[in-house]
């Protein structure tokens, strides 16, 4: 079953390569277990950036070699992606799945364009 | 008389606060004198960033204490804006006027959203 997911259109990573955005979903019921996946779309290729499962009210448990951290509050997930470089600029899409209890719902946001600028190296301190 | 002006939708300033973009106009005739103005639109307020007049084939002459530099090639103007900070993020609109010979033509682009990220300060070298 489909579900509406909202996320900001544009976000800038800071000079340390960290970008944060909120992914909000319109929950049709009282979900107790949720999975959030961030997908990156660039040059028509889609890559999973990070994924987390959480029980409502609990902290997010990220899967695999995650570069993300996050917190949840109600139907909002605050996501932070770290270690970004200019080559990581792209469209970051938030996918939300309501896993439990049934029925299963899934929604995909329109994507957040994250812009990343590589910092200038600092001069050597002799 | 109206004239079509094209410019990129989005540009990122580099970590030194420099952003470059091309402003291209569809010249209806053989203009010899052209004026290019860059306007910044933010929070519904429009300010003039820089302006230059040039004779076709010659270099751009910017007015007074300009933060812009540029070159022209045919119906294209390559503009560079310097000294940008995060607070300068906004929509930069290219306005082109064909001043001579008559008739006078004017065109305004849709704007280039320039994103600026302030760099992290380098650690003090003790």
């Amino acid at each position: 079953k489909a579900m509406h997911v909202a996320q900001p259109a544009v976000v800038l990573a800071n000079s340390r390569g960290i970008a944060s955005f909120v992914c909000e979903y319109a929950s049709p019921g009282k979900a107790t277990e949720v999975r959030v996946t961030v997908l990156r779309q660039a040059d028509s290729q889609v890559t999973e950036v990070c994924a987390a499962t959480y029980m409502m009210g609990n902290e997010l448990t990220f899967l695999d070699d995650s570069i993300c951290t996050g917190t949840s509050s109600g139907n909002q997930v605050n996501l932070t992606i770290q270690g970004l470089r200019a080559m990581d600029t792209g469209l970051y899409i938030c996918k939300v799945e309501l896993m439990y209890p049934p029925p299963y719902y899934m929604g995909i946001g329109n994507g957040t364009q994250i812009y990343v600028i590589d910092p200038e190296p600092c001069p050597d301190s002799d | 008389k109206a004239m079509h002006v094209a410019q990129p939708a989005v540009v990122l300033a580099n970590s030194r606060g420099i952003a470059s973009f091309v402003c291209e106009y569809a010249s209806p005739g053989k203009a010899t004198e052209v004026r290019v103005t860059v306007l910044r639109q933010a929070d519904s307020q429009v300010t003039e960033v820089c302006a230059a007049t040039y004779m076709m084939g010659n270099e751009l002459t910017f007015l007074d204490d300009s933060i812009c530099t540029g070159t022209s090639s045919g119906n294209q103007v390559n503009l560079t804006i310097q000294g940008l900070r995060a607070m300068d993020t906004g929509l930069y609109i290219c306005k082109v006027e064909l001043m001579y010979p008559p008739p006078y033509y004017m065109g305004i682009g849709n704007g280039t959203q320039i994103y600026v990220i302030d760099p992290e300060p380098c650690p003090d070298s003790d």
């Epitope: 999975r35 990070c50 695999d64 070699d65 995650s66 896993m99 | -």
Partner: antibody, heavy 119, light 107 residues
């Protein structure tokens, strides 16, 4: 092409430690983490944990917590897995693996390192 | 932790046979299920990811299906090189877990 090359077989005494290396090539090392799996003789596969190459963050299987440490050396593109206080139950082939476009899915594996623990 | 149960643990089949292996998760994992083939002395080889997507370079006689808790790996026409052990693995949540394996032997 992506390649993961592991260190050679090890024989260890009970109570000792072992350190297995996994040298990665064919991609930007810091763009992907490394996961470690093991397989006891004649048994199935067991996930041990993973390490994020760019910042060294790691996550270990509960049963190995306190005994395992995963590290990376970004200058050489090498991941390491150290297991301490070895027992005969730790006799296994140890594999490093890298994900592809999907999280927790492993198209790329090292050739495996046999660690034999003798009492 | 999510438990993955594979059945059968072993089976005997002939070249050309259609072979089906099932995998059941202890809770719903949507389509986050992957299949690997392993031959003696070798590392596992990814066959199917996200329940039904065929990994590049894998013959089309391999297919996967299912979602939620029940999944199936099918080999439409068994070839001599397919005699191996097959593992399912969930990539829904940490810790990642594997099924116990299904050994496909020659009849």
């Amino acid at each position: 092409q992506v390649q993961l090359v592991q260190s050679g077989a090890e024989v260890k005494m009970s109570g000792a430690s072992v350190r297995v290396s996994c040298k990665a090539s064919g991609y930007t090392f810091t763009s992907y983490g490394i996961s470690w799996m093991r397989q006891a003789p004649g048994q199935g596969l067991e996930w041990m944990g993973w390490i994020t190459a760019y910042n060294g963050n790691s996550n270990y299987a509960q049963k190995l917590q306190g005994r395992v440490t995963m590290t990376t050396d970004t200058s050489t593109g090498t991941a390491y897995m150290e297991l301490r206080s070895l027992t005969s139950d730790d006799t296994a082939v140890y594999y490093c693996a890298r994900r592809g476009d999907y999280l927790g899915v492993f198209p790329y594996w090292g050739q495996g390192t046999l660690v034999t623990v003798s009492s | 932790d999510i438990q993955m149960t594979q059945s059968p643990s072993s089976l005997s089949a002939s070249v050309g046979d259609r072979v089906t292996i099932t995998c059941r998760a202890s809770q719903s994992i949507s389509s986050y299920l992957n299949w690997y083939q392993q031959k003696p002395g070798k590392a596992p080889n990814l066959l199917i990811y996200t329940a039904s997507s065929l990994q590049s370079g894998v013959p089309s006689r391999f297919s996967g299906s299912g979602s939620g808790t029940d999944f199936t790996l099918t080999i439409s026409s068994l070839q001599p090189e397919d005699f191996a052990t097959y593992y399912c693995q969930q990539s829904y949540s940490s810790p990642l877990t594997f099924g116990g394996g299904t050994k496909v032997e020659i009849k």
